[in-house]
């Protein structure tokens, strides 16, 4: 018996579509082998119509596709615009058509209900708008126009030109009679309901000279689009509901076990707490379309999602909707990385951000998620070096360790830095991830002086104290600029065993600037790392002043004494939008932090690592 399973009998009507699901044991071989849908001919051969390798026969061009869902052990064959000719015997299978890994499916396409001659068929999704066209002869131009709905053998008046409106259609129907010369009237029905489905009759005039036209209205529930995304990754729901609802509140909701729909997010400010920090509703375009991005996908995010429009910001019958079925693949290509990173006030965090390793050249970004209204995510830093002004001297994006991961370092932490941050690139949008920074009780491990004032032409020595637990780490000093943090050359002043017998009193790595120049002014970081993986950092601002002459007065630079909690995000901040993510150059203009000058020259800056055991030692 074949391990492949599917529906033995499928029946539908002309013009409709079918989605045939075929199930297979999700072994490694089965998941990756070719999937196909073929039609059995008289000779017994099975001719491929569509396959997972991209083949589509000419007969199916533009109306069929095959989608594999490997984790679920399912593939789905969608066939649209069915005709009677599609009736027949088919096979869905794995591997080669002639082998036994297949399942027989019988498809029967019928004509559908017999309709009166000349009936116009209107097929519209629930919630949308239909315009029924009703022609008439000149002699009936001055006479009453009406639309009836046929229910069994009776006809029920829906609307007429004498201002009658059936209560079932109240506030959502109108009859339009054009000016003279146009021999057609129209009936527009908005916010279609499933109950509107059926046969309608247009009528102009009465008696034997009346004009009649039949209309068959088919109101369909939208077929959910199958969406398959990786665990920890990101999904974007693009929702286009039409101009009719462009100015109506929008929402995304998830269908629950009672078949009601719980709001996930809406434009009225409501948001499900389960999506805190990992959801954005992107502003709508002029045509009323909008999109919702969810990052950090979890298995429990699986389910059926609907987007829609209604003044209450939630699902209501007869308003337009779009549907998706989200599957979350646990065999994710997106590596595990911490979803919560903890730091102490005054300390630092180093966040690892995954990206698609095939896109190493993509621009990398880090943004701060803000929950107000529909959510927004202003960019704080990018790999090209632009840093938000208020993060100057304490934020850097590093390409290391590379091969699918970049690092973001944020230091001088305050309680205001707690929150959700997104890692993203201008490439594969499915690799957007979320990390939460939490500020916990404690002291920073690295200790550096407060802001330092150096005298031009003299020698400056800045100590950085570290605890024993970092004795095996590589220690470094670097000069921060808005394009990164340039490591300063270190002086190897002794054997690397300097910290083996760790002394509690004076474990330090020192930065020496000799002689101090104007270009040395700026932010310096002391940090520890293991290979390409960064640990804690501490920052110190060095101000440079002239030698004091009697009567002169030093004014500390603004940045050195900026309030530590100052954190303003002005309206010019760039935000994530669909267009912008695809091309970050489309972000709004903003101020760019000026580069903080030339890096300290190698001959003048040196780093000392020392302990009480032995002066010097390597900077490792």
């Amino acid at each position: 018996k074949s391990p492949v399973f599917g529906p033995q009998e499928v029946s539908s009507v002309e013009g409709n579509s079918v989605s045939i699901k075929c199930y297979y044991p999700p072994t490694s071989v089965n998941r990756h082998t070719r999937k196909y849908w073929c039609r059995k001919g008289a000779s017994g051969r099975c001719i491929t119509l569509v396959s997972s390798e991209g083949y589509v026969s000419s007969n199916y061009a533009g109306r069929a596709n095959l989608t594999n869902f490997p984790e679920n052990g399912t593939f789905v064959v969608n066939i649209a615009q069915l005709s009677r000719d599609d009736s027949g015997h088919y096979k869905c299978g794995l591997g080669i058509n002639s082998r036994g890994l297949s399942f027989d499916v019988s498809l029967e396409v019928s004509q559908g209900p017999e309709l009166p001659n000349g009936t116009e068929v209107y097929t519209v999704d629930v919630g949308r708008t239909v315009t029924i066209k009703c022609p008439f002869k000149t002699e009936n131009a001055p006479k009453t126009k009406a639309l009836y709905k046929k229910i069994g053998q009776t006809s029920v008046l829906v609307i007429d030109s004498r201002n009658y409106v059936n209560p079932n259609y109240k506030d959502r129907i109108r009859l339009r009679i054009p000016g003279t010369g146009q021999l057609i009237f129209t009936v527009v029905i908005d916010r279609l309901r499933l109950s509107d489905h059926g046969l309608y009759l247009c009528q102009a005039g009465d008696g034997s000279n009346r004009d009649e036209k039949n209309a068959d209205l088919q109101v369909l529930e939208p077929e959910p689009e199958l969406v398959y995304e990786d665990l920890r990754g990101s999904v974007t729901f693009h929702c286009a509901l039409g101009l009719e609802v462009a100015n109506v509140a929008k929402f995304l909701c998830r269908v629950n076990s009672r078949e009601t729909c719980d709001v996930v997010i809406n434009t009225l400010g409501k948001r499900d707490s389960a999506f805190e920090g990992r959801i954005l509703l992107n502003p709508q375009d002029k045509d009323g379309s909008f999109s919702v991005v969810i990052t950090g996908l979890r298995k429990e995010d699986e389910g059926r999602y609907l987007c829609g429009a209604h003044s209450d910001g939630q699902l209501q019958e007869g308003w337009p909707i779009q549907a998706w079925q989200l599957f979350v693949n646990e065999e994710s290509t997106i590596p595990r990385s911490p979803t919560v990173v903890k730091g102490v006030a005054g300390g630092s965090v180093a966040v690892l951000c995954p990206y698609n390793p095939k896109e190493s050249q993509s621009l990398k970004y880090w943004c701060l998620w803000e929950g107000a209204q529909n959510g927004r995510c202003p960019l704080l830093v990018e790999s090209q070096g632009l840093v938000q002004e208020q993060y100057e001297g304490r934020l850097s994006l590093l390409q290391e360790p590379g091969n699918g991961t970049f690092t973001v370092i944020l230091n001088q932490l305050t309680t205001q830095d707690a929150g959700f941050y997104w890692c993203l690139t201008n490439g594969d949008t499915r690799w957007r991830t979320t990390v939460e920074i939490k500020i916990i009780e404690g002291e920073p491990n690295l200790k550096v002086p407060g802001n330092v004032t150096a005298v031009l032409g003299e020698t400056l020595n800045i100590p950085c104290h570290f605890p024993c637990k970092f004795s095996s780490y590589e220690k470094y000093w670097c000069k921060w600029s808005n394009t990164g943090c340039q490591t300063l050359p270190s002086q190897d002043e002794g054997p690397s065993e300097a910290f083996v017998n760790c002394d509690e009193n004076s474990r330090l790595v020192s930065l020496t600037l000799n002689p101090v120049t104007r270009a040395d002014e700026g932010w310096y970081w002391c940090g520890v790392k293991q290979g390409h993986f960064y640990g804690e950092t501490a920052a110190v601002y060095v101000a440079v002043e002239e030698k004091k002459v009697a009567g002169s007065r030093y004014v500390s630079p603004a940045k050195a004494d900026a309030a530590p909690d100052e954190k303003v995000l002005d309206s010019g901040v760039r935000e994530i939008e669909n267009k912008a993510i695809q091309d970050p150059r489309l972000f709004a203009e903003e101020k760019v932090v000026a580069d903080t000058g030339d890096q300290a020259g190698g001959s003048r800056a040196s780093v000392d690592s020392s302990s009480s055991e032995e002066q010097g030692g390597s900077s490792k």
């Epitope: 529906p7 033995q8 499928v10 539908s12 409709n16 579509s17 079918v18 078949e259 079925q325």
Partner: nanobody, 127 residues
């Protein structure tokens, strides 16, 4: 409260026919999937047949052991389903359960793909 009620069970001779029915009540929406499972004494509950509705299309699934003998039918606007059983044999004996789901995701052969269940109706085939 959602209720599924099976009817039509009974005692029949081998090779005879029987028609089971299932009706769902307490629902404010149309079901997308209704199925039949059976359980013989001392055995696991096993899949028999399922009918799914989507748009104006219908999909019917059968276990190999009943193909060609059993036929499932139904009307999702009324949330009803029938199972016409012909050529019954001793292995068909058991309690037949009706199951239903508001959507048609997941493998229809697995009980986990159904949210609502009936109490069952006994079918006994004697020689």
């Amino acid at each position: 409260e959602v209720q599924l009620v099976e009817s039509g069970g009974g005692v029949v001779q081998a090779e005879d026919s029987l028609r089971l029915s299932c009706a769902a009540s307490g629902l404010s929406f149309s079901l997308s999937r209704m199925g039949w499972f059976r359980q013989a004494p001392g055995k696991e509950r096993e899949f028999v047949a399922t009918i799914e509705w989507s748009g104006r299309s219908t999909y019917k699934y059968y276990d190999d052991s009943v193909k060609g003998r059993f036929a499932v039918s139904g009307d999702n606007t009324k949330n009803t389903m029938n199972l016409q059983m012909k050529g019954l044999n001793l292995e068909d004996t058991g309690v037949y359960y009706c199951a239903a789901n508001p959507n048609n995701y997941g493998d229809p052969r697995t009980p986990g793909a159904y949210q609502y269940w009936g109490q069952g109706t006994q079918v006994t085939v004697s020689s």
